[in-house]
C-alpha cells in the first residue's frame, strides 16, 4: 500500500507512517514503528504539556516570583501551567503576568468606577455635578452632595467635584 501523506487527528507522520501523538501531560520517548506504538512518559513534578504533542521535553511550570510581587493563583498540573497573580493592591502588567503594577488611586474630583482586580487597574471617572470626592482613593466612589433641604437647612456654600456643599441655618424673619 501507498505510504500515507497525511494522518488522522492526534497522529503525526514520521518515516512514512502515522504515529499517535502523546496525550497532554506526557512527552515523547520514542516514535512508533511498524511493530510498536508511540512511547510516551508522564511529565515530571513541576512540568507540563497542555496539548497532544510529540515534544521530547515537558515545559517547566511558570515560577511566580514573590520578589516581583507575584503569587500562585492556580497551581500547575501535568497538563496545565501555573497561573500567577499579584499580591493585594497590585495587578498584572500583562496577560503573561511576569510583573506587577501598583493599583492607581482616583484623585480628588474623581471617583472609582471600577475597583482594580488582579489583572486590571482601577478605572476612575470624573464626579458629575451633584457629586464629589475629596480624597485620593482606590475604592471610594463619588459621593452625592449633602441635601441641605432634607435637614431643614440651606446651602451656604456650593459644592464642587472636590467638596461637599456647606449647609447652614435658614435665616428667620424677625417679627
Amino acid at each position: 500500500p501507498e505510504p500515507p501523506t497525511a494522518c488522522r487527528e492526534k497522529q503525526y507522520l514520521i518515516n512514512s507512517q502515522c504515529c499517535s501523538l502523546c496525550q497532554p501531560g506526557q512527552k515523547l520517548v520514542s516514535d512508533c514503528t511498524e511493530f510498536t506504538e508511540t512511547e510516551c512518559l508522564p511529565c515530571g513534578e513541576s512540568e507540563f504539556l497542555d496539548t497532544w504533542n510529540r515534544e521530547t521535553h515537558c515545559h517547566q511550570h511558570k515560577y511566580c516570583d514573590p520578589n516581583l510581587g507575584l503569587r500562585v493563583q492556580q497551581k500547575g498540573t501535568s497538563e496545565t501551567d501555573t497561573i500567577c497573580t499579584c499580591e493585594e493592591g497590585w495587578h498584572c502588567t500583562s496577560e503573561a503576568c511576569e510583573s506587577c503594577v501598583l493599583h492607581r488611586s482616583c484623585s480628588p474630583g474623581f471617583g472609582v468606577k471600577q475597583i482594580a482586580t488582579g489583572v486590571s487597574d482601577t478605572i476612575c471617572e470624573p464626579c458629575p455635578v451633584g457629586f464629589f470626592s475629596n480624597v485620593s482613593s482606590a475604592f471610594e466612589k463619588c459621593h452625592p452632595w449633602t441635601s441641605c433641604e432634607t435637614k431643614d437647612l440651606v446651602v451656604q456654600q456650593a459644592g464642587t467635584n472636590k467638596t461637599d456643599v456647606v449647609c447652614g441655618p435658614q435665616d428667620r424673619l424677625r417679627a
Epitope: 516570583d65 520578589n67 516581583l68 510581587g69 499580591e87 493585594e88 493592591g89 502588567t93 500583562s94 496577560e95 503573561a96 511576569e98 510583573s99 503594577v101 501598583l102 492607581r104 488611586s105 487597574d121 485620593s136
Partner: antibody, heavy 116, light 112 residues
Framework: EVQLVQSGAEVKKPGSSVKVSCKAS????????MHWVRQAPGQGLEWMGY????????NYNQKFKDRVTITADKSTSTAYMELSSLRSEDTAVYYC?????????WGQGTTVTVSS | DIVMTQSPLSLPVTPGEPASISCRSS???????????LYWYLQKPGQSPQLLIY???TLASGVPDRFSGSGSGTDFTLKISRVEAEDVGVYYC?????????FGQGTKLEIK
C-alpha cells in the same frame, strides 16, 4: 542582558516641547511598566509617571499631568516621554527605569537644557 | 503625597567604619498585604541610580552584604557595616505604597 538606551542631550527654548526616547532590549517589553524619573542639577529624584506597554495605559504625577505625555511603541520596544511648555526649571537629567521588583534597570539618562 | 525625609543630608565616614542613614515617611508604608514598600537606591557620581534594597529589607542581587535595611512602618534605616571607598555617592529612599512615588532628598556619603 537587559538594556535601556536613551536618546541624546537636547537644548530647548522656553515654551517648546521635548521628546525623549528609551529603547529597551533583553526582555519582553510588554511585561514590565516603564517609568520616567527626573533629576534637576544638584537636586534629588522626582517621579514623573509611567506607561504600561501592554495596555498603553499611562499614569502621571499630577504635578506634570497637563504637560507630560508618556507613550510606548511595542513594535520597536521603545518608550517616550514628551514634556511641553518647557521652562528653565525643567532643565534636568531625565531617566527611564523599568519596574520589576523595583526600579531594577535604568537608562543612562538624557540631559535636557531649557534656555533662551 | 507621602513625604520622605532623610537624615543626615551629608555623611562623612572613615573607610572601615559603619554608617547609618535614616528615612522617615509621613505615612506608614506597611501595606495590608504584609509588605513594606520602601526602597533604597545609590547614585554613584556621574551614574544612574542603582537598587540596593527593596521592600525595606531585601538585598538586591549583586549588592554586597555589608548593606542592610530595616525599619517599621514609618521609620527606616540603611546600614553599611564597613564603608568602602566604592560606596561614595548619594543614597535615596523611595516609597511605592501609593502614587505619586516619592523619594527622600538624598544623603551624600563621602570618605573622610
Amino acid at each position: 542582558e537587559v538594556q535601556l538606551v536613551q536618546s541624546g542631550a537636547e537644548v530647548k527654548k522656553p515654551g517648546s516641547s521635548v521628546k525623549v526616547s528609551c529603547k529597551a532590549s533583553g526582555y519582553t517589553f510588554t511585561s514590565y511598566t516603564m517609568h520616567w524619573v527626573r533629576q534637576a542639577p544638584g537636586q534629588g529624584l522626582e517621579w514623573m509617571g509611567y506607561i504600561n506597554p501592554s495596555s498603553d495605559y499611562p499614569n502621571y504625577n499630577q504635578k506634570f499631568k497637563d504637560r507630560v505625555t508618556i507613550t510606548a511603541d511595542k513594535s520597536t520596544s521603545t518608550a517616550y516621554m514628551e514634556l511641553s511648555s518647557l521652562r528653565s526649571e525643567d532643565t534636568a537629567v531625565y531617566y527611564c527605569a523599568r519596574w520589576g521588583y523595583s526600579f531594577d534597570y535604568w537608562g543612562q539618562g538624557t540631559t535636557v537644557t531649557v534656555s533662551s | 503625597d507621602i513625604v520622605m525625609t532623610q537624615s543626615p543630608l551629608s555623611l562623612p565616614v572613615t573607610p572601615g567604619e559603619p554608617a547609618s542613614i535614616s528615612c522617615r515617611s509621613s505615612k506608614s508604608l506597611l501595606h495590608s498585604n504584609g509588605n513594606t514598600y520602601l526602597y533604597w537606591y545609590l547614585q554613584k557620581p556621574g551614574q544612574s541610580p542603582q537598587l540596593l534594597i527593596y521592600r525595606m529589607s531585601t538585598l538586591a542581587s549583586g549588592v554586597p552584604d555589608r548593606f542592610s535595611g530595616s525599619g517599621s512602618g514609618t521609620d527606616f534605616t540603611l546600614k553599611i557595616s564597613r564603608v568602602e571607598a566604592e560606596d561614595v555617592g548619594v543614597y535615596y529612599c523611595m516609597q511605592h505604597l501609593e502614587y505619586p512615588l516619592t523619594f527622600g532628598q538624598g544623603t551624600k556619603l563621602e570618605i573622610k
